[in-house]
């Protein structure tokens, strides 16, 4: 708490300008009017105040707006935003995408802080859903943003927003998240032709079921090994050797390098060795000739 002292003669601030740069902590407290500060917040960023001085300015705004800052002030907080706590931000009602952008710009280059996470949460909840413009903005600043959301939160993403998603935005998503995003992507890109569709859907395929992979194998898509390795193991296991060969096209040779890793390892164990031999890659570990394969899961389903 800053001690209340009278402002020295001639030091009362008439403007928020650089004449305040070297004011001591107590001088700022005594000589800067909070209402003046609120109306001239946009000037603070241009002035090289120290962290300590910014703390004083924040304190003045907190006193003026104990229930939370109005959006007119929030939009111009600039670097003062970095001084806000998640508790401060929870009091805000941010509705403008321009305000969100302005504050995210300030945090650029930093990891997503608790303050930013709280701000985004407040903004998205206020909008009711993660619309395309918001998603566009958030993934531009934080490519990993989508993957930080729970599957439940992702369910509120409308398919139309999927157009804003770039491959790198999905790099850190786990299978549970891709399970939610894949059907939305499928819906969003459904009117595209084969090759264009594959380019768009590729990064979402970690959520694709077996039947969709089988369908893709009929379209000469030439899936790369990196994409194949991210597919759901349970979706890959039912694929035949011929289907995998068609799915990968010229990339099928890469299976040899990945034969010890999932899902390739598990898939190999499910294939007949003589089918694997047709690939000519030297893949080992398939079911030997003459062995009968019982699909117990199918048997249970029938009984």
């Amino acid at each position: 708490e800053v001690e209340k002292t009278a402002c020295p003669s001639g030091k009362k601030a008439r403007e928020i300008d650089e004449s305040l740069i070297f004011y001591k902590k107590w001088e700022l407290e005594a000589c800067v009017d909070a209402a003046l500060l609120a109306t001239q917040m946009d000037r603070v960023n241009a002035i090289p105040f120290t962290y300590e001085q910014l703390d004083v300015l924040k304190h003045k705004l907190d006193e003026l707006y104990p229930q939370g800052y109005p959006e007119s002030v929030i939009q111009h907080l600039g670097y003062l935003f970095l001084k806000m706590s998640p508790e401060d931000i929870r009091k805000w009602n941010v509705t403008s995408l321009e305000t969100l952008k302005a504050l995210l710009e300030v945090n650029k280059g930093h990891e997503m802080s608790p303050q930013v996470a709280t701000l985004i949460d407040r903004f998205v909840k206020g909008r009711g859903q993660l619309d395309k413009d918001t998603l566009d903005t958030l993934t531009a600043f934080y490519p990993g943003y989508l993957c930080s959301l729970s599957p439940e939160e992702l369910s509120s993403v409308p398919p139309s927003s999927i157009w804003a998603v770039r491959p790198q935005d999905l790099d850190t998503c786990d299978p549970r998240q891709l399970d939610v995003l894949y059907p939305k992507a499928r819906l969003a890109f459904q009117n595209m032709n084969g090759s264009e569709y594959f380019v768009k859907i590729q990064s979402f395929l970690g959520g694709a079921p077996t039947e969709d992979l089988k369908a893709l194998s009929q379209q000469n898509v030439s899936m790369d090994l990196a994409t194949f390795m991210k597919l759901r193991t349970d979706a890959v296991l039912p694929l035949t050797v011929a289907e995998v060969q068609k799915l990968l096209g010229p990339h099928v040779e890469g299976l040899k390098a990945e034969e010890r890793h999932r899902p390739v390892r598990d898939w190999i164990l499910r294939q007949r060795q003589d089918d694997l031999d047709t690939l000519g890659l030297g893949l080992q570990g398939g079911i030997p000739n003459g062995y009968l394969v019982l699909d117990l899961s199918m048997q249970e389903a029938l009984s």
């Epitope: 300008d17 650089e18 004449s19 305040l20 740069i21 070297f22 902590k25 603070v44 960023n45 241009a46 002035i47 090289p48 105040f49 120290t50 962290y51 300590e52 001085q53 910014l54 600039g78 670097y79 003062l80 970095l82 001084k83 300030v106 930093h110």
Partner: antibody, heavy 121, light 106 residues
Framework: EVQLLESGGGLVQPGGSLRLSCAAS????????MSWVRQAPGKGLEWVSA????????YYADSVKGRFTISRDNSKNTLYLQMNSLRAEDTAVYYC??????????????WGRGTLVTVSS | IQLTQSPSSLSASVGDRVTITCRAS??????LAWYQQKPGKAPKLLIY???SLESGVPSRFSGSGSGTDFTLTISSLQPEDFATYYC?????????FGGGTKVEIK
């Protein structure tokens, strides 16, 4: 190219005066507060003085207060340090440095090569 | 505010992990920067706001800490990293620097 170039250093007797200049290029000079930082031979860095973008506000370390004057000419993109009543302990390399900007970002993202000031009889 | 760096010098080999600490005499939030200086050259900004990497600085450099205790880490020392490193606080005036840490070849 974004750069700062100091000049004006040299040998001066105790009690003498010297004026350092720093020519800035490649950025909007008037938008940034500027500083002088010095480094005595074999020693660490010491912040000496600063001036606001318009030149209206100045700051001095206690060790130079009353003897040094910082100023700038924004039309010439030049920063100055007028050093009077020089002492042996003022011997140092003097660097001109640009502050990153406002909003608490008072670290130096651009430095000049420095100019050596030697105070000796 | 006084900044105390430790150690004042250290010897290390290429590939070593190097840690330098900077302690402030009072809390300075995350208002700390780290600089690298090579003989006869001007300092170069590496880290600002205690942990943010300046553009163009290799990712082997990292900063951490808040309040009074801060650390600069070089994950795998390279030949070009042998230099003197300084911390600087910008929490309040006057801005101050640490005494420096010289990293030498073992």
């Amino acid at each position: 190219e974004v750069q700062l170039l100091e000049s004006g250093g040299g040998l001066v007797q105790p009690g003498g005066s010297l004026r350092l200049s720093c020519a800035a290029s490649g950025f909007t000079f008037s938008s940034y507060a500027m500083s002088w930082v010095r480094q005595a031979p074999g020693k660490g860095l010491e912040w000496v003085s600063a001036i606001s973008g318009s030149g209206g506000s100045t700051y001095y370390a206690d060790s130079v207060k009353g003897r040094f004057t910082i100023s700038r000419d924004n039309s010439k993109n030049t920063l100055y340090l007028q050093m009077n009543s020089l002492r042996a302990e003022d011997t140092a390399v003097y660097y001109c440095a640009k502050w990153m900007g406002g909003g608490g970002r008072l670290y130096f993202d651009l430095w000049g090569r420095g100019t050596l000031v030697t105070v000796s009889s | 505010i006084q900044l105390t760096q430790s150690p004042s010098s250290l010897s290390a080999s290429v590939g070593d992990r190097v840690t330098i600490t900077c302690r402030a005499s009072q809390g300075i939030s995350s208002a700390l920067a780290w600089y690298q200086q090579k003989p006869g050259k001007a300092p170069k900004l590496l880290i600002y706001d205690a942990s943010s990497l300046e553009s163009g600085v290799p990712s082997r450099f990292s900063g951490s800490g808040s309040g009074t205790d801060f650390t600069l880490t070089i994950s795998s020392l390279q030949p070009e990293d042998f230099a003197t490193y300084y911390c600087q606080q910008f929490n309040n005036y006057p801005l101050t620097f640490g005494g420096g840490t010289k990293v030498e070849i073992k």
